[in-house]
Amino acid sequence: LSLEAPTVGKGQAPGIEETDGELTAAPTPEQPERGVHFVTTAPTLKLLNHHPLLEEFLQEGLEKGDEELRPALPFQPDPPAPFTPSPLPRLANQDSRPVFTSPTPAMAAVPTQPQSKEGPWSPESESPMLRITAPLPPGPSMAVPTLGPGEIASTTPPSRAWTPTQEGPGDMGRPWVAEVVSQGAGIGIQGTITSSTASGDDEETTTTTTIITTTITTVQTPGPCSWNFSGPEGSLDSPTDLSSPTDVGLDCFFYISVYPGYGVEIKVQNISLREGETVTVEGLGGPDPLPLANQSFLLRGQVIRSPTHQAALRFQSLPPPAGPGTFHFHYQAYLLSCHFPRRPAYGDVTVTSLHPGGSARFHCATGYQLKGARHLTCLNATQPFWDSKEPVCIAACGGVIRNATTGRIVSPGFPGNYSNNLTCHWLLEAPEGQRLHLHFEKVSLAEDDDRLIIRNGDNVEAPPVYDSYEVEYLPIEGLLSSGKHFFVELSTDSSGAAAGMALRYEAFQQGHCYEPFVKYGNFSSSTPTYPVGTTVEFSCDPGYTLEQGSIIIECVDPHDPQWNETEPACRAV
């Protein structure tokens, strides 16, 4: 038996209510309101991890402030995890890093001259200045130290909630410092740091702070060089004036570590390499190093994004007199996000934000029920993740639909085939004082003992108004309940399968006709609730023509209101 009715409905079924567990992030500083804007970079190359940047996904922080859309900074955040840059060599002082939670537009600049011969590590250390060059307001959840005028960040952290615990050697008291470990020559690096304090009348005070950075200088042959960066942003510049032997080239490493939950974005400001020189970029911090780019892709303006909170850049140059070439890259941290949740088949998903704290809400098309969480929250982590698996929309095997006003019931698997050995019961209950009209969108049962019964009542013993075993054809006009219930049964045997059924229902008031429906068309009605005397005129969408039934129907018979003709169907021309 394979019978198909001419129309398909589009009503809304009442959903299965589920409670949403809301996750709340820790309070964070206010974030300026802003709209969505795209940043694209030139040239545009269709490469792995080279995307236009959607810096804000939707307007976070609008109206309510949306604290939950911002990543929370723990009061004692863990330092970024140690590097495991296999196969690249492990560097010193990577076990303890200052932490931050938000990128800022601070810029790292060119090296400066050493200012002091004194430092905490060795008498021979050279200490370039790390100067603050621009005032910057803290971003959301930004761990920025607030220093008063004249204060200097020292190796002993001030007692503030944001201060990370020092677990290893290094300048943990100097937040956001680009640390330089130069084996071969002293390299000065100027970075930036800002602090801002607000007085009672909300005036902003900008403070310039001088921070001493120590550089270890050792002479080593053949002259590898490496730098570690742990700030939210900085500059990666090709080494110059290295006092390395003249007969070897350079093999330099730039390691960048940002706060977990952020990725590293590297922008090529300038690059001019000589033939044979290589620059490679890898994402670290995952199970395996992730190759991101090499010199062939590193064109000016290109942006490389590591989806992990650690990255490494390796520069291998030629020996003099040919080399080395030059480059100037700028890196900054960017907030990692959850992947866009998969839209369920026969459903949809609405996302407020893909960043930690953002949420995704799922709902199903009429006739389908959600299996799984209706509401997911993006959680902050080294790689942010949704707090539950994406749900799926399933055509449930039965159920109770109370206050059924308009909607659909479909067999499990629809529009795919149903399973064997099913017995599904649906109870439809119209609102008090109303009856139900049931329309057959599709009924396709296997030729064996599969069976669909629709009963005029609320139980398995109520007399049927449709039984696929006994009825010769599907009624185009559908079925009417005498009361407020329909009881639908689908049973399948152990062999054979077909698409099953899709039934559309609508409730209507006593003394009225049910609301008409025509797929691929429209209708106009003389009155909105279809009492006796109402006339309805049908029309079809472009490319379709009216067939069977009548263009105009009327609700007749005050004792038992019904349409005087069947609804027409719109067929493709």
Epitope: V465, V471, E472, S482
Partner: nanobody
């Protein structure tokens, strides 16, 4: 041509029993509904019982549940209604019907073919 012919009606005392029959000819379908209806003088016709030719499922109006039994002998192509514990309100003309349309099986909707009826009288 489908024909339905009822027989077995008559008069009976309240509490008595009666069996009415309906011989079906020309109806070759293995599926569809067969039903019994009755009409008392001055009243509308009402469904009494129905049976599915393929499923054998049986349905009864509430007023006769436990007293009447519908059955179908497919070999003889005959429909029966066994009536026990008859009451005066069971009096009326009993009609046999057959059909395979959708609709409440205890209403006339599904039925296309009808017999002429047989009279049943229950006196107190």
């Amino acid at each position: 041509d489908v024909q339905l012919v009822e027989s077995g009606g008559g008069s009976v005392q309240a509490g008595g029993s009666l069996r009415v029959s309906c011989a079906v000819s020309g109806y070759t379908k293995s599926s569809g509904w067969m039903g019994w209806f009755r009409q008392a003088p001055g009243k509308e016709r009402e469904g009494v019982a129905a049976i599915g030719r393929r499923s054998g499922d049986r349905y009864y109006v509430d007023s006769v549940k436990g007293r009447f039994t519908i059955s179908l002998d497919s070999t003889k192509n005959t429909l029966y209604l066994q009536m026990n514990d008859l009451k005066p309100e069971d009096t009326g003309t009993y009609y046999c019907a057959a059909g395979g349309r959708a609709g409440n099986v205890l209403t006339s909707q599904p039925y296309r073919y009808w017999g002429q009826g047989t009279q049943v009288t229950v006196s107190s």
